[in-house]
């Protein structure tokens, strides 16, 4: 983890890095490694990609063990083949308003993701995509045999759209906070980021938190009951300690993780909260990192890597963060 010991590199030849990832000397000048990319965890030994202007951001001085690869101030963003300046806002599609900040893009949905439970006034609510409309709209299908006009008996009607107001005015500052991005790893420890100007100076800043959707070693499919296709939120396992690059959380946590599906759907966090976790490293150093904790999960077909990058982003976000 640090460079105090002698150089020891794996015997095999230099690693093969994925396309677009630089092969660089580790931070100790010892071994050739694949450079860490934007938003990934980095250490003294695991450097960030210098060819992309990334550096290892450790946060507070107490956290000098493990950081997050961050773009230098003012770094532009490449999104959908277009280059955006840091601080520039753009509408990536009719559904999302995005902001570039130091190489990271944060997007906020412009369409409402509100839910509608059945009621006498709307017995069979459905969200439908209407021709010429960007956002899906609520439709209240009515029973076919209704003739009287009353709360539950109205003719089929297309609902007006509505969007959540994602902004808030505070002391001459239009406060905007993007949703937390999906966790960078589908299992094991990853990173989730967002962009916000919810601070005293109203300046856009990036925030990151650790996240774990599920442990990699868990074989959750075994627990799916016969005839069922998904486990949305498996029973909470025994208390665990989180591990981060050789450091271990000081407390144990009864964390919830998301389950799995066998029918092609994805199971991802739906409601989350952010809490600080203290990690103790082998040399005795203690560092505090914000971490996502899952409250509920949801099963859906909008899986990472779907054709529509925006739909995929939209449904994979962790929203309703309680922090």
């Amino acid at each position: 983890q640090n460079c105090s010991g002698p150089c020891r590199c794996p015997d095999e030849p230099a690693p093969r890095c994925p396309a677009g990832v630089s092969l660089v000397l580790d931070g100790c000048g010892c071994c050739r490694v694949c450079a860490k990319q934007l938003g990934e965890l980095c250490t003294e030994r695991d450097p960030c990609d210098p060819h992309k202007g990334l550096f290892c951001h450790f946060g507070s001085p107490a956290n000098r063990k493990i950081g997050v690869c961050t773009a230098k101030d003012g770094a532009p963003c490449i999104f959908g083949g277009t280059v955006y300046r840091s601080g520039e806002s753009f509408q990536s599609s009719c559904k999302y308003q995005c902001t570039c900040l130091d190489g990271a893009v944060g997007c906020m949905p412009l369409c409402s993701m509100d839910v509608r439970l059945p009621s006498p006034d709307c017995p069979f609510p459905r969200r439908v995509k209407l021709p010429g409309k960007c956002c899906e709209e609520w439709v209240c299908d009515e029973p076919k045999d209704q003739t009287v006009v009353g709360p539950a008996l109205a003719a089929y009607r297309l609902e007006d759209t509505f969007g959540p107001d994602p902004t808030m005015i505070r002391a001459n500052c239009l406060v905007q906070t993007t949703e937390w991005s999906a966790c960078s790893k589908t299992c094991g420890m990853g990173i989730s980021t967002r962009v916000t100007n919810d601070n005293a100076s109203c300046r856009l800043e990036k925030q990151s938190r650790l996240c774990m959707v599920r442990p990699c070693e868990a074989d959750l499919e075994e627990n799916i009951k016969k005839g069922k296709k998904c486990i949305r939120t498996p029973k909470i396992s025994k208390p665990i300690k989180f591990e981060l690059s050789g450091c271990t959380s000081m407390k144990t946590y009864r964390a919830k993780f998301c389950g799995v599906c066998t029918d092609g759907r994805c199971c991802t966090p739906h409601r989350t909260t952010t809490l600080p976790v203290e990690f103790k490293c082998p040399d005795g150093e203690v560092m505090k990192k914000n971490m996502m904790f899952i409250k509920t999960c949801a099963c859906h077909y909008n899986c990472p890597g779907d054709n529509d990058i925006f739909e995929s982003l939209y449904y994979r976000k962790m929203y309703g963060d309680m922090a």
Partner: antibody
Amino acid sequence: EVTLKESGPVLVKPTETLTLTCTVSGFSLSTFGVHWIRQPPGKALEWLAVIWRRGGTDYNAAFMSRLTISKDTSKSQVVLTMTNMDPVDTATYYCARDGGFDYWGQGTTVTVSS
Amino acid sequence: ETVVTQEPSLTVSPGGTVTLTCRSSIGAVTTSNYANWVQQKPGQAFRGLIGGTSNRAPWTPARFSGSLLGGKAALTLSGVQPEDEAEYYCALWYSTHYVFGGGTKLTVLG
């Protein structure tokens, strides 16, 4: 973010009329109805009235002659008026969104006393 | 006058299963009553858990399920957590009006 907020007088004299306003955000009153519910101290919830998404109304029969519910969709406000108030009407009054009563306001406490 | 009746109080151990019921004084509860279940935790606002008999709100954990059981509306909690300790109200629709039950105080032991 969906929110509902009740406002109105804290103290009402007997025989007076109570006017309560529910201001909503994060959804449209042309898409969702809004209910009024109350809870007297130490007692259960009591449903009072609803204004549906298309403007139709329904009332608790026990209060029908005293209640009027209306809305101003452009202002995102629902108004409930209750006439001839009595000390037994002392309660916390809530508005809630139609569709599983999913979202509620924090409530406004009304005391009826001379 | 239609009366909706709930168990005044129920006690359950963590990890256990408990069923809260909602009875109508004028006959069996059906899907036309659009049974709703509302939760209030101490010091918090009310929030809907279940609407239209069995449909969960997005924040409602999977351990909560709504159904019709023996002519009554039912809310079943499987694998009860300490944070489920709360007051639970059901509401039934009767063509022109809703009626709320008296509420069930659920206590989670330990």
